[in-house]
Interface confidence: low
């Protein structure tokens, strides 16, 4: 999946299986990524687990779990708030669009989480105070999470180089250049560009991610994934000058 | 990841020696610190394991319930803007404890927010 870190680095990661996205003293988010196509290096998020840890008189421990085709509007115990404590309503789940868009407000830690299902896969976005981000007891282990450190270098795909390469090939099919050589129904480059431009008129990294995803999978839902990811940034990012990220040299992790 | 071993050792250590409300609290706190130490030792191999994270929060919960010393290496740090868990009067009277921004404004200006997102392939 494409990752925008807390420090506004933008990476495309091929991490497969379960990985910690956020892991601090108040919150643990784990994602499971699966290959989008057989033999593909590119992966997308198929499962998401969020643990809100027991906190003072505010919330009991609550676990939220979403999977492909299952985006519940409740915690796994069926509740929609933080439990029986005095401040239980400082943790709330709201269903924005049934089965497609859920928002979780954790006011006790100043945090908002947006989870969406777009096509077959999940997207995740969070707004969190720096103080909570850095509330890590054991930096050796907890400090390794993806939102903070990014993905390991050997797990990154240089999709900007791929994008440049794709542009040079014109309208020809890009099966050979694609990370998924067997990708069915992939788009010609011009079609991918046109579809992404419709939703993402600014040629930023979200637009480039959209083009990459269409060329890799042929799944037009990834256009919406990039579009909603940018919409979530608009809602959640505190610095309105940093909504759009543009091409740059690939960042090293951590 | 040996987190269930840590749990088991803690259950064994606390099941036959002291009541939560008794004067033996230092003993119970010592068992909690041993438990915390066990979880720290296994932390590297438990990364991403949810039982581990649940245990860590459980230790924090018990430490505050039993007023165990929090200044040792095994106590879990808390947000500086929120009152300590032991401050039950403030905790029960003030809804601000459970509202980060309100309690933050008491101490400083607006908190700095950050964003992380994951999408697509």
């Amino acid at each position: 999946p494409h990752l925008r870190t807390f420090t506004d680095r933008f990476q495309t990661c091929k991490v497969q299986g379960a990985w910690p996205l956020i892991d601090n003293n108040y919150l643990n988010v784990q994602v499971t990524n699966t290959p989008v196509l057989p033999g593909s290096a590119a992966t997308a998020t198929s499962k998401l687990t969020i643990i809100f840890k027991n906190f003072q008189e505010c919330v009991d421990q609550k676990v939220y779990q979403a999977e492909m085709d299952e985006l519940p509007a409740a915690f796994v115990d069926g509740s929609k708030n933080g439990g029986d404590k005095h401040g239980a309503n400082s943790l709330k789940i709201t269903e924005k669009v049934s089965g497609q868009h859920v928002e979780i407000q954790a006011k006790y830690i100043g945090t908002t989480i947006v989870v969406r299902q777009v096509g077959r896969y999940l997207t995740f976005a969070v707004r969190m105070p720096e103080e909570v981000v850095n509330a890590v007891e054991d930096w050796d282990s907890q400090g390794l999470y993806l939102c903070l450190r990014g993905c390991p270098l050997n797990q990154q795909i240089d999709f900007q180089a791929f994008h440049t390469n794709a542009e040079g090939t014109g309208a020809r099919r890009l099966a050979a250049a694609s990370p998924a050589p067997t990708a069915p129904e992939t788009f010609p480059y011009e079609t991918a560009v046109a579809k992404c431009k419709e939703k993402l008129p600014v040629e930023d990294l979200y637009y480039q991610a959209c083009v990459f995803d269409l060329l890799t999978t042929g799944d037009v839902n990834f256009t919406l994934a990039a579009y909603y990811a940018l919409e979530d940034v608009k809602m959640l990012h505190s610095n309105k000058d940093k909504l759009h990220l543009y091409e740059r040299t690939r960042d090293l992790p951590g | 990841c040996k987190i269930l071993k840590c749990n088991s050792e803690f259950w064994s250590a606390t099941s036959g020696s002291h009541a939560p409300a008794s004067d033996d609290t230092p003993e119970f706190c010592a068992a909690l610190r041993s438990y915390a130490l066990c979880t720290r030792r296994t932390a590297r191999t438990c990364r991403g394991d949810l039982a581990y994270h649940s245990a860590v929060h459980g230790i924090e919960d018990l430490m505050s319930q039993h007023n165990c010393s929090k200044d040792g290496p095994t106590s879990q740090p808390r947000l500086r803007t929120l009152p300590p868990a032991g401050d039950s009067q403030e905790r029960s009277d003030s809804p601000e404890i459970c509202h980060y921004e309100k309690s933050f404004h008491k101490h400083s200006a607006t908190p700095n927010y950050t964003h992380c997102g994951l999408f697509g392939d």
């Epitope: 796994v76 | 088991s8 039982a51």
Partner: antibody, heavy 120, light 109 residues
């Protein structure tokens, strides 16, 4: 929804063995221990032991040591309880139950139960 | 024979309070924070009602409460309702073994 679904009823002869399965869904299987509890007809609950699906560690009731074996298969999120050298007094409903995470010890989710009848 | 002793039965009228005791030794109850309570309706699996002596899982009505004094743990049902008629078991983790009480039948008159 967190669920534990157990295998169907069994009828066994004395001296035989029985293996009951318990398939977990709706949560991360390796994050919780699994306990086994039995209940003879008209009697109370009897704790048999627990297993950590993560590590395979087990803790059996002393009176069942040597006769009971608990295992898990993490690839299918299934726990198994095998009881050997069956006697008529082993006739009971056998339950699997999820052990709450963290330091607390309690059983928060239960299977529907499996009736094992030992009869010659 | 269970090492945790519960009364065989208790009864009360709707709206009344009933208390079930669970008495053990200092090692099984007195010194243990791992006391939990389970409700079982006939032919059904048990259901967790309280854990860690006093904590109530979400979904359990607040008329169920727990306490402990010395070597006795107690479950109190205040405002008894017809659906509370069931068997109730206490459980305590005590070192190597986990012990259930013998069970108490609660009858709503």
């Amino acid at each position: 929804e967190v669920q534990l679904v157990q295998s169907g009823a069994e009828v066994k002869k004395p001296g035989a063995s029985v293996k009951v399965s318990c398939k977990a869904s709706g949560y991360t299987f390796t994050s919780h221990g699994i306990s086994w509890v039995r209940q003879a007809p008209g009697q109370g609950l009897d704790w048999m032991g627990w297993i950590s699906p993560y590590s395979g560690n087990t803790n059996y009731a002393q009176k069942l040591q040597g006769r009971v074996t608990m295992t898990t298969d993490t690839s299918t999120s299934t726990a198994y309880m095998e009881l050997s050298s069956l006697r008529s007094e082993d006739t009971a409903v056998y339950y699997c139950a999820r052990v709450g995470s963290g330091p607390y010890y309690y059983m928060d989710v239960w299977g529907q139960g499996t009736l094992v009848t030992v009869s010659s | 024979q269970s090492a945790l002793t519960q009364p065989r039965s208790v009864s009360g009228s709707p709206g009344q309070s009933v208390t079930i005791s669970c008495t053990g030794t200092s090692s099984s109850v007195g010194d243990s924070i791992y006391v939990s309570w389970y409700q079982q309706h006939p032919g059904k699996a048990p259901k967790l009602m309280l854990y860690d002596v006093t904590k109530r899982p979400s979904g359990v009505p607040d008329r169920f409460s727990g306490s402990k004094s010395g070597n006795t743990a107690s479950l109190t049902i205040s405002g008894l309702q017809a659906e509370d008629e069931a068997d109730y078991y206490c459980l305590s983790y005590a070192g190597t073994d986990t012990l259930f009480g013998g069970g108490t039948k609660v009858t709503v008159l």
